[in-house]
């Protein structure tokens, strides 16, 4: 279930899967919500002089039990992802950090009157993902009033400094406020040429589509089908950007299919699941656990409740079912993607539905019945 | 459809055949479960026959060649139009059936959940539009529903695609640049249905389109969110109480 | 009642030019695309060109092309047809209709539902 | 252009008769384009059919309108004395629109 509970001055102690610089707890836990293997985190506030370098430290953890040990730290603040917490699962962070440096890559420095205009400017630029304001009362006369654009491999800051008269914070174009606009075509027997930055397998342009929304880096993707002639990248999603945030023109290429990410998208964003259920498909990963159960849908339900999961496989082989049902296996990979997806499977894929905002039952909100 | 594929049985339970008995029975329409009593068409499909009585209601089929004369079928008791539809124009393409006899649901015959209000500003990323309506522009009923999935596209692009209409915010495009997928004749009053936070909405009912499956000529859809206060309205003002609003 | 009153007609000398309005009533203007049909005296019916509701698309016949700008205000209900280079083949009587558009087996329809009176257009010198 | 050929060009008939008027297209035209109108002298058309086979409203249902691809039919079951008049078929399928050149029925 959900857990949003904060335990002050406590770390939890193993299971690390990643570390990274966030301003706040808060930051962080929304980092771990979207981290496809992360469940708990502990995130440093204060620490003693000798360790500066893992001040704001964001350490995010796995379980196999749900839980760590937990250790004193004064300075330290740990929690669970929002994994499962429905409506409170939002990549949108507004806050503002006075006095502190986010830094990453400056790629631009213009002049702006205040913060508001600074976040404006980076909500509208396809590469920045945060940005450092330096006050008029900053020390360095050069940088006073100036906007620092900044982006990074990981999409947060390279290390956090505390620093006067300096304002950061983040992009807004996963608050749908970006003004660059969001075109939402989608271009058959396409591919993009530009510049790869990750790679993931998926079922389907859709699900491309929507992992390089939530990716820091990807501004638009390329998805080859299973029909694709080159076996090794058969329902591969290439997750693409470039120098000036625009593809270069497409390339006609047979059972290819390009897009961009919605990530600049003023309306609502698609959500960050996949609800789909794919038939006679069967995706490939660590076995988690295996329960029987009647249905598709039901076993959809099931590896959304259990944490861990990522996706699962409902299986209709006449081996595979018993009188409860038939075998629903749950399984999980290193990046919340498939491992490899096959066809002609007796049975269907999909996804955990973890990271929906609305995890609950399938009945609908409005209900038209006779008395 | 056009470049679409067969669809299972119980896939799409909310999807009906609305058919008219004249001389012979023909489908003519699509349309949406929306509660016991209730289905949820185009208003168009209703242009020139405006009679209750000659209409047949199926659901609950894969094949229209499963329907024979004993095939149980649905009579209206009631027709909705919208008040502001007009023949002379595109605009208010929708139409309430209330049912003589309340639907028992199975497996293979249930409602579709109705988007709120709010939803008017969601985007959708897993749609489909399903029917027994032409494969091609000159081409014919199909015998097995068809289904295709197919993206949204934004109303003002819409809008440029179809500078002699108005694209208004109470309708809502699909198709894909380069066409080849979309509804066509046949297929008017049926679903368009987008799977959202774990459940399938209606987002659209089948209205319009320029050709069937022609480039940069997306299809045309009534979108169901901006009706939602006339369709209440109409539930709950008949004699049946249809109507229950939960949180979500 | 829709009603559609065409005026601005009148004897022109050739190579002279002319607007016609028709006044629109008793629908909303600004949901239909409208076009201008003439018939010479004696002949039959030719559409000379159409715009959109919104007024961003217009199209002509070739007979009018370069010569002819349909348009409307949709603020006061009226739509116009500017004519210039005027030539004795111009001479007609000029109807505007309002073109309906509606629905029919998931395509739209067209037809011109509703005609004004028409007003004469002459071009002699 | 699509050039819409009507045929045949006069049909002289008394009241009561059957009038079977024929519009032939050099296209293919979707028949939701394709509508039928009667003209009197002095007067302006008026919408019959659309669509092909929909009647317009008041119009009577001795009007009936058939056909679709290239051959379409107007017919009118028994004529009446006011039903005397021109009648164009006319294509808004492609543009250029376009009108027949009417076919004239006259009293016999």
């Known amino acids: 279930g959900c857990m949003t509970q904060l335990y002050k001055n406590t770390f939890f102690r193993g299971g690390d899967l990643a570390a990274i610089y966030t301003p706040d707890a808060q930051y962080c836990q929304k980092m771990c919500t979207f981290h496809p293997r992360c469940l708990l985190f502990s995130f440093l506030a204060v620490t003693p002089p000798k360790e500066t370098n893992k001040r704001f430290g964001c350490f995010m953890k796995e379980s196999i039990t749900g839980t760590l040990p937990r250790i004193h730290r004064t300075g330290a603040i740990s929690g669970h992802s929002l994994k499962q917490c429905g409506h409170q699962i939002s990549a949108c962070h507004r806050d503002i950090y006075k006095g502190l440096d986010m830094r990453g890559s400056n790629f631009n420095i213009s002049k702006t009157d205040n913060i508001e205009e600074c976040q404006k400017l980076c909500t509208n630029n396809f590469h920045c993902q945060f940005f450092t304001y330096a006050t008029s009362a900053f020390y360095r006369p050069e940088y006073r009033k100036k906007c620092l654009l900044k982006h990074s491999a990981s999409g947060t800051p390279t290390s956090i400094k505390s620093a006067d008269n300096l304002v950061s914070g983040f992009s807004l174009k996963s608050c749908a406020l970006s003004e660059i606009g969001c075109p939402m075509d989608i271009f058959q027997h396409s591919a993009f040429a530009d510049l790869n930055v990750s790679q993931v397998i998926t079922p389907d342009a859709f699900v491309c589509r929507t992992i390089c929304t939530f990716h820091p880096n990807c501004l638009f993707f390329t998805f080859y089908t299973n029909e694709w002639e080159t076996e090794s990248q058969r329902n591969v999603c290439f997750l693409k950007t470039s120098k000036s945030g625009r593809p270069s023109p497409p390339i006609p290429q047979e059972n290819a299919i390009s897009g961009y990410s919605l990530l600049t998208c003023r309306k609502t964003r698609p959500e960050p699941c996949h609800s789909k259920i794919y038939s006679g498909v069967d995706f490939e990963g660590e076995e988690l656990n295996v329960t029987f159960v009647q249905g598709a849908d039901v076993c959809q339900e099931t590896c959304t409740k259990t944490i861990r999961c990522q996706f699962f496989i409902y299986s209709l082989l006449p081996q595979d079912c018993k009188e409860e049902g038939c075998k629903c296996s749950l399984r999980l990979s290193t990046d919340g993607s498939p491992t490899r997806i096959t066809y002609g499977m007796q049975g269907s894929s999909g996804y955990s539905l973890r990271l929906c905002k609305l995890v609950d039952s399938p009945d609908c909100t409005t209900k038209i019945n006779a008395r | 459809i056009v470049g679409g594929t067969n669809a299972s049985l119980g896939e799409w339970p909310w999807q009906v055949s609305l058919q008219v008995k004249l001389v012979s029975q023909t489908h003519l329409c699509g349309g949406s479960i929306i509660g016991r009593q209730w289905v949820l068409t185009a208003a168009h499909c209703f242009d020139g026959i405006p009679y209750p009585d000659v209409w047949r209601i199926y659901g609950g089929i894969l094949s229209l060649s499963e329907i024979t004369k004993e095939t149980p079928s649905s009579r209206i008791k009631e027709l909705i139009i919208h008040q502001e539809y007009k023949v002379s124009e595109g605009n208010y393409d929708i139409a309430l059936i209330k049912l003589q006899t309340p639907l028992n649901y199975t497996e293979f015959q249930k409602p579709i959940c109705l988007p709120s209000k709010a939803d008017t500003n969601t985007i959708y990323t897993n749609c489909w539009v399903t029917g027994w309506g032409y494969t091609k522009e000159q081409g014919e009923t199909q015998n097995i529903l068809q289904k295709a999935t197919i993206p949204l596209v934004p109303n003002e692009e819409c809008q440029k695609k179809y500078r002699d209409y108005v694209i208004n915010k109470q309708m809502i495009c699909a198709g894909y640049k380069e066409g080849g997928t979309d509804a066509c004749k046949g297929d008017s009053g049926g679903p368009l249905v987008c799977k959202h936070s774990g459940r399938w909405q209606l987002v659209g009912i089948t209205s319009w389109g320029e050709g069937c499956g022609r480039k940069d000529q997306p299809g045309v859809y009534t979108k169901v969110s901006e009706y939602m206060d006339w369709i209440l309205e109409k539930t709950q003002s008949s004699d049946v109480r249809a109507l229950e609003t939960s949180s979500a | 009642e829709v009603q559609l009153l065409e005026s601005g007609g009148g004897l022109v000398q050739p190579g002279g030019s002319l607007r016609l309005s028709c006044a629109a009533s008793?629908?909303?203007?600004?949901?239909?695309?409208m076009t201008w049909v003439r018939q010479a005296p004696g002949k039959g019916l030719e559409w000379v060109s159409y715009?959109?509701?919104?007024?961003?698309?217009?199209i002509y016949a070739d007979s009018v092309k370069g010569r002819f700008t349909i348009s409307r205000d949709n603020s006061k209900n009226t739509l116009y047809l500017q004519m210039n280079s005027l030539r004795a083949e111009d001479t007609a009587v000029y109807y505007c209709?309002?073109?309906?558009?509606?629905?029919?087996?998931?395509?739209?329809?067209?037809?011109?539902?509703?005609w004004g009176q028409g007003t004469l257009v002459t071009v002699s010198s | 252009e699509i050039v819409l050929t009507q045929s045949p060009g006069t049909l002289s008939l008394s009241p009561g008769e059957r009038a079977t008027l024929s519009c032939r297209t050099s296209?293919?035209?979707?028949?939701?384009?394709l509508a039928w109108y009667q003209q009197k002298p002095g007067q302006a058309p008026r919408l019959l059919i659309y669509?092909?086979?929909s009647r317009a409203t008041g119009i009577p249902d001795r009007f009936s309108g058939s056909g679709s691809g290239t051959d379409f039919t107007l017919t009118i079951s028994r004529l009446e004395p006011e039903d005397f008049a021109v009648y164009y078929c006319?294509?808004?399928?492609?543009?250029?629109?376009?009108f027949g050149q009417g076919t004239k029925v006259e009293i016999k």
């Open positions: 209709a309002r073109v309906a558009r509606g629905i029919a087996a998931r395509s739209r329809t067209s037809y011109f539902d509703y």
């Open positions: 669509g092909a086979s």
């Open positions: 296209q293919f035209v979707n028949s939701n384009y």
């Open positions: 715009i959109s509701p919104s007024g961003g698309h217009t």
């Open positions: 008793g629908f909303t203007f600004s949901h239909y695309l």
């Open positions: 006319q294509q808004s399928s492609r543009t250029p629109w376009t």
